[in-house]
């Protein structure tokens, strides 16, 4: 019973990291416009790793698409790398465990295949949160790098006349969601790799049947069956069915001059 | 039609206040409104805003120790209120709607309020 | 503060001629995110509230002769009118509408010789 609330537990809890991961790599705020000790705007900048968002006052809010790919930064296509890695290896792993759920019956299934299956995509959540969490860390030490050079250089003379006040961007939703639903994953992953210790088959124990003979004791042993030395009863090797199969289940938008957003 | 319509000209004496009026009709009542102040020939000067939506209000330094921006959402009326008044506070005040490129599209036609004694 | 000078104060043209009017501003209004700029110009008549002429610095808005145009980037901008009309004569303002507090320029005031 364990076994199959933890494998439950573990597949729940690596289904809805994998949703979180999803959500924030199509998240727009990776990264937000600072505005601790920054001169005050009335348009708030926020970007994602898909495209840039402008959100003025007025209540318009204007998204551009990044159109290029050898323009942007090498580190930004690495971070969308692990995201995507990691949303397609979760996504594997959660098919992967559907059948491997022990409340779940498929044809004959042996509990060894079960045991494999939930090994494999406990694995499987574990390498997709680790990919989540390094590609949300790696954006997340772009921005901070970024941030302190900005900080440095943020009035920047123009022609010793004008200053031009540089944007400092800060930690946007989207990361923290990012580490939240990787952390998940990888807890739900650790929980289906315990689960599968539990799934495995243990080789069954029987009891030896001792046939004493004129002063010597000789055990036989049914073929195909190891021998137990002890004679403790052996329940660990029961199937155990609750039940029948469960099923587990460029944008902008216009204030109009009539009508204010 | 999007009309903003403001109360009428005020005579107020020196050290009181002053509350103006600005009726939206022809839009939902939703985004920030603006006030603008414009001392006889002289320029315009922002006062500041208040978003009908959540009542938060953002002023300009110079008037934050004397205005105040409320609003009654069941008449889409906002009101300025601006305290210890000078003869210098003589001028006419404007209410403005935002717009694209937190423009103002949209203005009263403004209250004249003549501060003497 | 963000300053905002309007040069000439005041101007006197013929009708029809070209006219310009120009506006600086302290810092750049140039928003990096969408690469426009936050300023807005505005028609103000004896006795009448401002009108709103151009934003985004170039975008004319609807109802506004297309005689009128907005150009400029960062921190120095220019509001031309490409033949003065009897009607144009008003007070011409800019406004910064990137930074609070919101700044207007001082203003400049157009005349028929």
């Known amino acids: 019973m364990a076994v199959t609330a933890c494998q439950g537990l573990g597949f729940v809890v690596s289904l809805i990291g994998i949703a979180g991961i999803i959500a924030a790599t199509c998240m727009d705020q990776w990264s937000t416009q600072d505005l601790y000790n920054n001169p005050v705007t009335a348009v708030f900048n926020y970007q994602g790793l898909w495209r840039s968002c402008v959100r003025e006052s007025s209540g318009f809010t204007e998204c551009r698409g990044y159109f290029t790919l050898l323009g942007l930064p090498a580190m930004l296509q690495a971070v969308r790398a692990l995201m995507i890695v990691g949303i397609v290896l979760g996504a594997i792993g959660l098919l992967v465990s559907i059948f491997a759920l022990k409340c779940i019956r498929i044809g004959s299934m042996e509990d060894s295949a079960k045991a494999n299956m939930t090994l494999t995509s406990g694995i499987m959540f574990i390498v997709s949160g680790l990919c989540a969490i390094a590609g949300v860390s790696v954006f997340a030490n772009m921005l901070v790098t970024n941030f302190w050079m900005s900080t440095a250089n943020m009035y920047t003379g123009m022609g010793g006349m004008v200053q031009t006040v540089q944007t400092r961007y800060t930690f946007g939703a989207a990361l923290f969601v990012g580490w939240v639903a990787g952390g998940l994953t990888l807890i739900g992953g650790v929980m289906m790799c315990i689960a599968c210790r539990g799934l495995a088959p243990e080789e069954t124990n029987y009891k030896a049947v001792s046939y004493h003979a004129s002063g010597h004791s000789v055990a036989y042993k049914p073929g195909g069956f190891k021998a137990s030395t002890g004679f403790g009863s052996n329940t660990k090797n029961k199937k155990i069915y609750d039940g029948g199969a469960r099923t587990e289940d460029e944008v902008q938008s216009y204030p109009s001059k009539h009508d204010y957003v | 039609q999007v009309q903003l319509v403001q109360s009428g000209a005020e005579v107020v004496k020196p050290g009181a206040s002053v509350k103006v009026s600005c009726k939206a009709s022809?839009?939902?009542?939703?985004?920030?409104v603006h006030w603008v102040i414009q001392a006889p020939g002289q320029g315009l000067e922002w006062m500041g805003e208040i978003n009908p939506t959540n009542a938060r209000s953002n002023y300009n330094e110079k008037f934050k120790k004397r205005v105040t921006m409320t609003l009654d959402r069941s008449t889409s009326t906002v009101y300025m209120e601006l305290s210890s008044l000078r003869s210098e506070d003589t001028a006419v005040y404007f209410c403005?709607?935002?717009?694209?490129?937190?423009?103002?599209?949209?203005w009263g036609q403004g209250t004249l309020v003549t501060v003497s004694s | 503060d963000i300053v905002m000078t309007q040069s000439p104060d005041s101007l006197a043209v013929s009708l029809g001629e070209r006219v310009t009017l120009n506006c600086k501003s302290s810092q750049s209004l140039l928003n990096a995110g969408n690469q426009k700029n936050y300023l807005t110009w505005y028609q103000q008549k004896p006795g009448q509230p401002p009108k709103l002429l151009i934003y985004w610095s170039s975008t004319r808005e609807s109802g506004v002769p297309d005689r009128f145009s907005g150009s400029g980037s960062g921190t120095d901008f220019t509001l031309t009118i490409s033949s003065v009309q009897a009607e144009d004569v008003a007070v011409y303002h800019c406004q910064n509408n990137y930074y609070y507090p919101l700044t207007f320029g001082g203003g400049t005031k157009l005349e028929i010789k």
């Open positions: 403005a709607g935002i717009y694209y490129g937190n423009s103002f599209a949209h």
């Open positions: 022809g839009y939902t009542f939703t985004n920030w």
